[in-house]
């Protein structure tokens, strides 16, 4: 009768074990072990017992002791069970950002590990078990589906293998995968709101505001604002679940035309974009041209108004004929035209909006001098000793110099309050003089003596 000790062994992969083969007869013809494993016999006294060191045990094996005794041949098997922890435990790669509300499939792959009967695969969120399954197949694969929630943000998902050899008197061997940190996000389906001027004049500034509500986590949102190909640098302010990005836009002549204003919000692996058209226009004030800004009375004057080629002008309220960017009027300068304003109003349609610009020029008409009855009466009759103010107004442009003299020497105090005396009586020659020439007018002052009863 052949026996083996130990009859069952659990050992780590690559390990060694001592196996004793014994027989019940004293003088066996043969006593040995049959195994593909490397073996070394340890020398012992006696014939009915042999000890072998079996080394580099890589897989489960059943070495067989045999003996040949006078009463016959017999065998006995020992069962070597190899244990080893998995060589690979990993979660299938996933995008780090996942939208809230999406079903996320976690897939854990386990390569190797034995004995498989004692190997379990556990999927975890933090320390919370999501799924526990025995390892089956090579590689073993365990999957579970998680409905992504907002409060999963920053959570670590991992996969753990448990090789439980405690029933065999050994310990629980655990292997854990690298964690997958989930970053959850909410990017609403509504595009960002973009507020900006629809039209902007060259060499001016405008303000652009892009905002969006319902974001999570709002601090991770990237905002890209651009006008045409120009990157704008917005100042971003954050709310609990919203942001507002504000940028100042300065436009120059280089920007003239139709530009795309874009606001793109990028969160996780998704983006939302809003596009708006901004028309940048150049519209200088119209030009009012007078043939000469200063003319003499009776001169023909041409007043021209010229504006942007696409503008429509009115000159002193009269639209150009035909309607367009140029208008003109002709006039013969009269004194009444002195100081007259010629106003040109230009209207340009830019992206459906009407833009108005005005320009005004004043005409100076040189005329006179003039002395007439209305402003310089030819006859004054005043009571002696009364208080009077002689009035004589000369007209003209430039304003004439006025002198009224009696006998070429005695002046009439124009515009001054005087006490009427006999000396004031007489005929005065009033002379108005300017660069435009001179005129004279006779003025007679009569003094009434008081009547005594």
């Amino acid at each position: 009768q052949t026996s083996v000790s130990p009859s069952k062994v659990i050992l780590p992969r690559g390990g060694s074990v001592l196996v004793t083969c014994s027989t019940s007869c004293d003088q066996p013809k043969l006593l040995g072990i049959e195994t593909p494993l490397p073996k070394k016999e340890l020398l012992l006294p006696g014939n009915n017992r042999k000890v072998y060191e079996l080394s580099n045990v890589q897989e489960d094996s059943q070495p067989m002791c045999y003996s040949n005794c006078p009463d016959g041949q017999s065998t006995a098997k020992t069962f070597l069970t190899v244990y080893w922890t998995p060589e690979r435990v990993e979660l299938a790669p996933l995008p780090s950002w996942q939208p809230v509300g999406k079903n996320l499939t976690l897939r854990c792959q386990v390569e190797g590990g034995a004995p498989r009967a004692n190997l379990t695969v556990v999927l975890l969120r933090g320390e919370k078990e999501l799924k526990r399954e025995p390892a089956v197949g090579e590689p073993a694969e365990v999957t579970t589906t998680v409905l992504v929630r907002r409060d999963h943000h920053g959570a670590n998902f991992s996969c753990r293998t448990e090789l439980d050899l405690r029933p065999q008197g050994l310990e629980l061997f655990e292997n854990t995968s690298a964690p997958y940190q989930l970053q959850t996000f909410v990017l609403p389906a509504t595009p960002p709101q973009l507020v900006s001027p629809r039209v902007l004049e060259v060499d001016t500034q405008g303000t652009v505001v892009c905002s969006l509500d319902g974001l999570f986590p709002v601090s991770e949102a990237q905002v890209h604002l651009a006008l045409g190909d120009q990157r704008l640098n917005p100042t971003v302010t954050y709310g609990n679940d919203s942001f507002s990005a504000k940028a100042s836009v300065s436009v120059t002549a280089e920007d003239e035309g139709t530009q795309r204003l874009t606001c793109a919000v990028i969160l996780g692996n998704q983006s939302q974009e809003t596009l708006q058209t901004v028309t940048i226009y150049s519209f200088p004030a119209p030009n009012v041209i007078l043939t000469k800004p200063e003319v003499s009375e009776g001169t023909e004057v041409t007043v021209k108004c010229e504006a942007h080629p696409r503008a429509k002008v009115t000159l002193n309220g009269v639209p150009a004929q035909p309607l367009g960017p140029r208008a003109q009027l002709l006039l013969k300068a009269t004194p009444e035209d002195n100081g007259r304003s010629f106003s040109c109003s230009a209207t340009l349609e830019v992206a459906g909006q009407l833009i108005h610009k005005n320009q005004t020029r004043e005409l100076r008409v040189l005329y006179g001098p003039r002395l007439d009855e209305r402003d310089c009466p030819g006859n004054w009759t005043w009571p002696e000793n009364s208080q009077q103010t002689p009035m004589c107004q000369a007209w003209g442009n430039p304003l004439p110099e006025l002198k009224c003299l009696k006998d070429g020497t005695f002046p009439l105090p124009i515009g001054e309050s005087v006490t009427v005396t006999r000396d004031l009586e007489g005929t005065y020659l009033c002379r108005a003089r300017s660069t435009q020439g001179e005129v004279t007018r006779k003025v007679t002052v009569n003094v009434l003596s008081p009547r005594y009863e």
Epitope: A226, G228, E254, D255, G257, T258, R260, P309, R310
Partner: antibody, heavy 119, light 109 residues
Framework: QVQLVESGGGLVQPGGSLRLSCAAS????????MSWVRQAPGKGLEWVSA????????YYADSVKGRFTISRDNSKNTLYLQMSSLRAEDTAFYYC????????????WGHGTLVTVSS | SSELTQDPAVSVALGQTVKITCQGD??????ASWYQQRPGQAPVLVIY???SRPSGIPDRFSGSSSGNTASLTITGAQAEDEADYYC????????????FGGGTKVTVL
């Protein structure tokens, strides 16, 4: 569809003059800025000049400033480049291109016209 | 400076991905636009703005930018993509209105 057709290229002696034209169709010409870009044989692209949609603003590369004049006739949907005091280094294919705004990227290009400056 | 720098040439195996870069100070302020020029033909706009494609341009062309570098990526290059590619941007130095890179010759193997 948008079409830009250049003409006026040819052989000219150094110091000579030439006027290039670019006839445009398929878009609202006066709403678009226009540019000239040139390419010497076997070389890269070089920006030459640009003009705003209204014609009120013009821009030139330093290499052509004072010698070239860009202009446009919106009533004829035509862009022009008057080139004078021509030099051997002005030899190139000249392309006209349109932009939604004066300093903007080039949406469409013509097929080009070759200007050769040689004695 | 108002220069844009490109690698003179790159090659890509058919169906593989190639990335062309363009460097310049102006790219910190302005997005680049990219033009494809096949031999004997006029340039064609392929990318503008942050990453916009004109209609008719396949979605294998994409643009990106970071700092002073703009990139054009062709994902799954086709034989017809063999061409010269030029980057172009507004000139932030103010000397010129727009500037071009020297061009990159893309060869599809």
């Amino acid at each position: 569809q948008v079409q830009l057709v250049e003409s006026g290229g040819g052989l000219v002696q150094p110091g000579g003059s030439l006027r290039l034209s670019c006839a445009a169709s398929g878009f609202t010409f006066s709403s678009y800025a226009m540019s000239w870009v040139r390419q010497a044989p076997g070389k890269g692209l070089e920006w030459v000049s640009a003009i705003s949609g209204s014609g009120g603003s013009t821009y030139y590369a330093d290499s052509v400033k004072g010698r070239f004049t860009i202009s446009r006739d919106n009533s004829k949907n035509t862009l022009y480049l008057q080139m004078s005091s021509l030099r051997a280094e002005d030899t190139a294919f000249y392309y006209c291109a349109n932009s939604a705004y004066t300093g903007g990227w080039y949406d469409y290009w013509g097929h080009g016209t070759l200007v050769t400056v040689s004695s | 400076s108002s220069e844009l720098t490109q690698d003179p040439a790159v090659s890509v195996a058919l169906g593989q991905t190639v990335k062309i870069t363009c460097q310049g100070d102006s790219l910190r302020t302005y997005y680049a636009s990219w033009y494809q020029q096949r031999p004997g033909q006029a340039p064609v706009l392929v990318i503008y703005g942050e990453n916009s494609r004109p209609s008719g341009i396949p979605d294998r062309f994409s643009g990106s930018s970071s700092g002073n570098t703009a990139s054009l990526t062709i994902t799954g290059a086709q034989a017809e993509d063999e061409a010269d590619y030029y980057c172009n941007s507004r000139d932030s130095s103010g000397n010129h209105l727009r500037v071009f890179g020297g061009g990159t010759k893309v060869t599809v193997l």
